[in-house]
Interface confidence: medium
């Protein structure tokens, strides 16, 4: 065979962000010539697991019946064909929520904001953390990642949005975590509905969805604008 074997595709169902205790299935899809599939987890002895292919041999299933901290991490898979092992798949990051108590998300001065004005979303945690994530429902990616400098332990992160437009309207949640494992997140905060008034179009309603639901492509990540917070937290765009 000319050249290396094509890399397989790796994904998780129902998604790659799973609540503690829930089940998740990792799928690795290769080619019809695959004889064996291997799953490697970063910083774990390789292989992490091996599976025979399911008919028609082009994919394998790796089951996690109950999500715990041990399963959170970065995975790659390979398949073996008669001519050897494939290239590794692109990595899959399996994130567990529920590792810490849920933070509180609030809007200052109010979740009802006039277009063109400013609002700050404030995520507060019971325990000191060094990383905070803000998620907008139906957005494709985590919106904003704030990590404190020098591992400073904070109880809050500020997400300023200015000037607010109708695009900012919608349902937000936040998570907190420790930098030593960004694969372990807190329970999600209760949802916060940001309502933007005084614009031509009202924000479209965002249905409540579970954290593990795969995000739809309809929203691009929304980047709050404004100055970097003075809270010792560094901004990371995702």
């Amino acid at each position: 065979q000319a050249g290396p074997l094509p890399k397989p595709t790796l994904w998780a169902e129902p998604g790659s962000v799973i609540s503690w205790g829930n089940s998740v299935t990792i799928w690795c899809q290769g080619t019809l010539e695959a004889r064996e599939y291997r799953l490697d987890k970063e910083e774990s002895p390789a292989p992490w697991d091996r599976q025979n292919p399911l008919e028609p041999k082009n994919k394998a299933r790796f089951s996690i019946p109950s999500m715990t901290e041990d399963y959170a991490g970065r995975y790659r898979c390979y398949y073996r064909s008669p001519v050897g092992w494939s290239q590794p798949s692109d990595p899959l990051e399996l994130v567990m929520t529920g590792a810490y108590s849920k933070p509180t998300l609030s809007a200052l001065p109010s979740p009802l904001v006039t277009s063109g004005k400013s609002v700050t979303l404030l995520c507060q945690s019971r325990s000191p953390m060094d990383t905070f994530l803000l998620i907008k429902e139906r957005a494709a990616h985590p919106l904003l990642h704030l990590r404190s400098e020098h591992g400073a332990q904070q109880h809050q992160a500020e997400f300023p949005m200015s000037p607010v437009t109708s695009v900012h309207g919608g349902t937000y949640r936040c998570f907190s975590s420790h930098g030593f494992s960004h694969y372990l997140l807190s329970h999600p905060s209760d949802p916060l509905e940001l309502i933007v008034s005084g614009s031509l179009e009202d924000p479209r309603p965002s249905p409540t969805r579970s954290v593990s639901t795969a995000a739809g492509p309809e929203d691009q990540p929304l980047m709050p604008t404004g100055s970097v917070p003075h809270s010792g937290l560094r901004r990371h765009w995702e």
Epitope: S101, T104, L108, L122, Q124, S125, R126, S127, P128, S148, A152, Q153, Q154, H155, Q156, E158, P229, H230, S231, G232
Partner: antibody, heavy 121, light 107 residues
Framework: QVQLKESGPGLVQASETLSLTCTVS????????VNWVRQPSGKGPEWLGR???????VYNLTLESRLSISGDTSKNQVFLKMNRLRTDDTGTYYC???????????????WGQGTLVTVSS | ETVMTQSPTSLSASIGERVTLNCKAS??????VDWYQQTPGQSPKLLIY???NRHTGVPDRFTGSGFGSGFTLTISNVEPEDLGVYYC?????????FGPGTKLELK
């Protein structure tokens, strides 16, 4: 009603270890956070650390190497141990409880009456 | 650590007067600021939590405000029992730190 009471020796020698007990009533240590705060005479309070049954312990980093906080939820008691005492550790030591079980704001809503600790050289 | 500064260091007020106490954090602490009152020989008493919320039983003449790094406590009509030292506390980041206090005296 919520009550916190500190107890321990009033006088300790420098370089020795201070052991204080905070006995609480009117609430469960499995639901609330208890903090230790000290106040040198005529000065402002200083936070030492906290005990939270399901969230772990957090210490003031400047004192962390000398401090140990633990709890016995069945006896409704939280303990503070501070070793290698110095004369500037003299002051009134308080235990406090947060305002509600959410533990987001109002960290020191309820205070004990405090216990005066004098470190002599 | 987050350093809290308070101003003024002390002030004299007449009964019924309106006074404003200021607290400044060296970095943003969100709304994670409480205000405490301490009278001689007593434990500090929580007045305001989360920057602007009155604790149970605190008279409505006490009002807190602020966000980020600037906070104020306003006493609208000073009463004799309001005399004492007022401390602000931040718990936005570890270690939690108190301000040095503002002493309120009677004119």
């Amino acid at each position: 009603q919520v009550q916190l009471k500190e107890s321990g020796p009033g006088l300790v020698q420098a370089s020795e270890t201070l052991s204080l007990t905070c006995t609480v009533s009117g609430f469960s240590l499995t639901s609330y956070c208890v903090n230790w705060v000290r106040q040198p005479s005529g000065k402002g309070p200083e936070w030492l650390g906290r005990f939270w049954y399901d969230e772990g312990k957090v210490y003031n980093l400047t004192l962390e190497s000398r401090l140990s906080i633990s709890g016995d939820t069945s006896k409704n008691q939280v303990f503070l141990k501070m070793n290698r005492l110095r004369t500037d550790d003299t002051g009134t030591y308080y235990c406090t409880r947060d305002r509600d079980t959410m533990g987001i704001t109002g960290w020191f809503a309820y205070w004990g009456q405090g216990t005066l600790v004098t470190v002599s050289s | 650590e987050t350093v809290m500064t308070q101003s003024p260091t002390s002030l004299s007020a007449s009964i019924g007067e309106r006074v404003t106490l200021n607290c400044k954090a060296s970095q943003s602490v969100g709304i994670n600021v409480d205000w405490y009152q301490q009278t001689p020989g007593q434990s500090p008493k929580l007045l305001i939590y989360g920057s602007a919320n009155r604790h149970t039983g605190v008279p409505d003449r006490f009002t807190g405000s602020g966000f980020g790094s600037g906070f104020t406590l306003t006493i609208s009509n000073v009463e004799p029992e309001d005399l004492g030292v007022y401390y602000c506390l931040q718990y936005g980041s570890v270690p939690y730190t108190f301000g040095p206090g503002t002493k309120l005296e009677l004119k």
